[in-house]
C-alpha cells in the first residue's frame, strides 16, 4: 500500500481541519487507513481520524480540533494497520479555508433594489469574524451569457443591486463565498445558491 499524493490539509479556523490525499490504487479508506494527529503541546494526546473515500483512490479525513490559535502545530501520521505510510506536520493558521457563508436570502420588496443578505459563518469571538470579505456570484439560467461577480470588501454581509441592472421577467441565482485577507486564506466553498424572479419594471416615463 502506497501514498500517491501526500495529505494536504486546510483548517476552518474553528473546529475542523480537512485532510485529503490519494492512494496508489483503489482503497477502502475507512477500513484500511487511520490518520493520527497530535497537537505539539504539553501532555497532549494522540487522536484518531477515520477517513472516508473521496473517489476511487482518494481519501478525506475531518480532524476535530479545539479552537485554533496561530502557535498550534500538529504532527500527522497515516497508518495502514501497523505500517506507517506517511509522516508530516500541519500548522492550521497557515492553511485556512473559511467556512462557507450561510442563509443567503434575496429581498425584492425593497424599492428599485435587490437586497442580498447572508450570515457570517463565524461567531463574534472567532478571529476570522471581523476579517471576512465576500464575493457574490449572480447568474441567470435564462440568459447563459449573464454572470457577474460582485466583490464585497466591507464587513457587513449585504449587497444591494439596482433592479434596473437586471433584465425584467427572468430568473436569477446568487451564491456567496468568503475569504480572510489578513490570514491569507483560500476562498471558501460557495454557499448554496438562492433563486429569485426579477419582476422589476422601469417606470413608464423612463422606458
Amino acid at each position: 500500500m502506497k501514498v500517491l499524493q501526500e495529505p494536504a490539509c486546510v483548517s476552518d479556523y474553528m473546529s475542523i481541519s480537512t485532510c485529503e490525499w490519494k492512494m496508489g490504487g483503489p482503497t477502502n479508506c475507512s477500513a484500511e487507513l487511520r490518520l493520527l494527529y497530535q497537537l505539539v503541546f504539553q501532555s497532549s494526546e494522540t487522536h484518531t481520524c477515520v477517513p472516508e473515500n473521496n473517489g476511487g483512490v482518494g481519501c478525506v479525513c475531518h480532524l476535530l480540533m479545539d479552537d485554533v490559535v496561530s502557535m498550534d502545530n500538529y504532527t500527522l501520521d497515516l497508518w495502514a494497520g501497523q505500517q506507517l505510510l506517511w509522516k508530516g506536520s500541519f500548522k492550521p493558521s497557515e492553511h485556512v479555508k473559511p467556512r462557507a457563508p450561510g442563509n443567503l436570502t434575496v429581498h425584492t420588496n425593497v424599492s428599485d433594489t435587490v437586497l442580498l443578505t447572508w450570515s457570517n459563518p463565524y461567531p463574534p469571538d472567532n478571529y476570522l469574524y471581523n476579517d471576512l470579505t465576500y464575493a457574490v456570484n449572480i447568474w441567470s439560467e435564462n440568459d447563459p451569457a449573464y454572470s457577474r461577480i460582485h466583490n464585497v470588501t466591507y464587513l457587513k454581509p449585504t449587497l444591494r443591486i439596482p433592479a434596473s441592472t437586471l433584465k425584467s421577467g427572468i430568473s436569477y441565482r446568487a451564491r456567496v463565498r468568503a475569504w480572510a485577507q489578513h490570514y491569507n486564506t483560500t476562498w471558501s466553498e460557495w454557499s448554496p445558491s438562492t433563486k429569485w424572479y426579477n419582476s422589476y419594471r422601469e417606470p413608464f416615463e423612463q422606458r
Epitope: 497537537l39 503541546f41 501532555s43 494526546e45 494522540t46 490559535v69 496561530s70 502557535m71 498550534d72
Partner: antibody, heavy 125, light 112 residues
C-alpha cells in the same frame, strides 16, 4: 472531595531504589495529566516529571532522566514514580499534583490545582 | 529551559497594606490571546503548595479576591490588595508552557 495521597517515601542508600505512589480520588483520574514536584530541605520547588492522562506521553527533568520513570494505572487511579540509582541530591519531599485536563485536543490548563501532602525521600549512607 | 526570576526574595509587610511580587521569564509565556502559561503558588510553613493564580490572571477556586495576577509575555505580577496574617509563607511563580516546568526562587512574605 478531590484528593491526592502519596506514599512510598523513606530512607534509602545511594544507588538504591524507591517507588512512590499517589492515589487520586474525587475526580476522573484518567482525564488529567499528573505531575511530580519535589522540594529539597530548605530549598524551593523543582519540577520532576509529568505524564499525560493516557500515560502515552512522559516528560522528565534533566536531573532525573534515565533514572526515574513516571507511570500510571488508571484502573487503580494511581500515579507512580519509580526512582532508581538514587543520589544524595534526590533527598526531598516529593509532591504529586493534578495537572491539565488532557482529553481535549488542546489540553485545558487550570494550574496544578490539587497537591498531595507530600512524602519524604532521604538518600543517605 | 525557561528561567523564572522573582523579586523581591524577601517581603516584610504590615497587615492591611498591599504587597506586590514580580516574576520575569526568559522567554514569552504567551501562547494565545489572553493565555499566559504562568501560575502563582503559596506554600505556608509545613504545608503543601497551593494554587493561587493560573494562566497569568485567573484566580483559582476558593482563593480570596485580594489576590490578583497580571502581566503578559515575560513580565508578571502577583498583587495582594490588603495583606492578612494568614498570607505569610513562600510565594512561587511557575511557567507551565511546556516541560521542563520551571519555578521562581520563591519570595518569603512575612509580617512586620
Amino acid at each position: 472531595e478531590v484528593q491526592l495521597v502519596e506514599s512510598g517515601g523513606g530512607l534509602e542508600q545511594p544507588g538504591g531504589s524507591l517507588r512512590l505512589s499517589c492515589a487520586g480520588s474525587g475526580f476522573t483520574f484518567r482525564d488529567s495529566a499528573m505531575t511530580w514536584v519535589r522540594q529539597a530541605p530548605g530549598k524551593g520547588l523543582e519540577w520532576v516529571s509529568s505524564i499525560s492522562g493516557s500515560g502515552d506521553n512522559t516528560y522528565y527533568a534533566d536531573s532525573v532522566k534515565g533514572r526515574f520513570t513516571i507511570s500510571r494505572d488508571n484502573s487503580k487511579n494511581t500515579l507512580y514514580l519509580q526512582m532508581n540509582s538514587l543520589r544524595a541530591e534526590d533527598t526531598a519531599v516529593y509532591y504529586c499534583a493534578k495537572d491539565r485536563l488532557s482529553i481535549t485536543v488542546r489540553p485545558r490548563y487550570y494550574g496544578l490545582d490539587v497537591w498531595g501532602q507530600g512524602t519524604t525521600v532521604t538518600v543517605s549512607s | 529551559d525557561i528561567v523564572m526570576t522573582q523579586s523581591p526574595l524577601s517581603l516584610p509587610v504590615t497587615p492591611g497594606e498591599p504587597a506586590s511580587i514580580s516574576c520575569r521569564s526568559s522567554q514569552s509565556l504567551l501562547y494565545s490571546i489572553g493565555k499566559n502559561y504562568v501560575d502563582w503558588y503559596l506554600q505556608k510553613s509545613g504545608q503543601s503548595p497551593q494554587l493561587l493564580i493560573y494562566l497569568g490572571n485567573k484566580r483559582a477556586s476558593g482563593v480570596p479576591d485580594r489576590f490578583s495576577g497580571s502581566g503578559s509575555g515575560t513580565d508578571f505580577t502577583l498583587k495582594i490588595s490588603r495583606v492578612e496574617a494568614e498570607d505569610v509563607g513562600f510565594y512561587y511563580c511557575m511557567q507551565a508552557l511546556g516541560s521542563p516546568y520551571t519555578f521562581g526562587q520563591g519570595t518569603k512574605l512575612e509580617i512586620k
